[in-house]
């Protein structure tokens, strides 16, 4: 038997993916475990294999269909179970009745690119991925810029309270290397959280012209 405290957390990406993390103190390392999804009103069910992400936590992605298909709604309830093999049978280790639109975490923004760069300014754009059409343009973003000699945690957060998929960074230092990240969040859902940060975009401001400041 497996003793210790267990935590089972899942998020819906608003389209066709439920990502889950299960952590268990004192869990058996060699046990094969999976997450099983049983919707209350759909004809499909889905399973994914839990893979270790640290000493005592495992993660997997339930792929419900094509990436941009709308597989769940606000009235769906999905019973999610962690099942671990014990000899010839499966044991239920954790269970939850999951309301997808109360537990949203969108995919990280993608396709970050520098639209235009100057000595003190840089215009950057991005795209959102696999976000439900239900949200329309009602999303918010947070962005941060990594300056030389600082850490990401020290970077001030810039908040965009609308679906604005670009930003103009100002008061930058000429001829300096920066990195930029952005994340997204819908308005809906009691337990909804920010998406992961995007992959960082590296860029360099232009050098100041000799004898003048631009």
């Amino acid at each position: 038997a497996v003793n210790g405290t267990s935590q089972f957390t899942c998020f819906y990406n608003s389209r066709a993916n439920i990502s889950c993390v299960w952590s268990q103190d004192g869990a058996l390392q060699d046990t094969s475990c999976q997450v099983h999804a049983w919707p209350d009103r759909r004809r499909w069910n889905q399973t994914c294999e839990l893979l270790p992400v640290s000493q005592a936590s495992w993660a997997c992605n339930l792929i419900l269909g094509a990436p941009d298909s709308q597989k769940l709604t606000t009235v769906d309830i999905v019973t999610l179970r962690v099942l671990c093999r014990e000899g010839v049978r499966w044991r239920v280790m954790a269970i939850q009745d999951f309301k997808p639109f109360e537990n949203l975490r969108l995919m990280a923004p993608i396709s970050l690119q520098v639209v235009h760069v100057e000595t003190h300014r840089c215009n950057i754009s991005w795209e959102i991925s696999q976000a439900s059409h239900y949200f329309e343009r009602h999303l918010e973003f947070e962005a941060r810029t990594l300056s030389p000699g600082h850490t990401w945690e020290e970077a001030p957060l810039l908040t965009l309270k609308q679906k604005q998929e670009w930003i103009c960074l100002e008061t930058l230092t000429p001829d300096t290397q920066y990195e930029f990240q952005v994340r997204v969040k819908p308005l809906q859902g009691e337990f909804t959280t920010w998406s992961p940060w995007s992959q960082p975009l590296a860029f360099r401001t232009k050098p100041a012209a000799l004898g003048k400041d631009t």
Epitope: T73, Y134, F135, L187, Q188
Partner: nanobody, 119 residues
């Protein structure tokens, strides 16, 4: 402002049929589920049938095989075809729509339409 307009209720004999309809109109919205609930005196409102995006219908056990729900997402209208009606189907039938407005989901209700099944 969102409005739900129900119609089709009335008095019918046991074994008869009725067709309820409910149209949603008003400000810009996206509907992800529409359905019917009924209330009888002294009892809580209970689900009769609803249909969510992706065509997944849910029915109360007491109406399975007798009632069918149809949703027209283009017209934002939901229909309830009721046949083989019984006296216990009597009640006020309410339309409910789950709507997305400005990035948030809310439930909206109609005023209700009376269905009376006489024996």
């Amino acid at each position: 402002q969102v409005q739900l307009q129900e119609s089709g209720g009335g008095l019918v004999q046991t074994g008869g049929s009725l067709r309820l309809s409910c149209a949603v109109s008003g400000s810009r919205f996206i509907s992800d589920v529409m359905g019917w609930y009924r209330q009888v005196p002294g009892k809580q409102r209970e689900l009769v049938a609803d249909m969510a995006d992706g065509g997944s219908a849910k029915y109360a056990d007491s109406v399975k095989g007798r009632f069918s729900i149809l949703r027209d997402s283009v017209k934002n209208t939901v229909y309830l075809q009721m046949s083989s009606l019984k006296p216990e189907d009597t009640g006020i039938y309410y339309c409910k729509a789950g709507l997305w407005l400005a990035g948030r989901h809310s439930d909206y209700w109609g005023q209700g339409t009376q269905v009376t099944v006489s024996s």
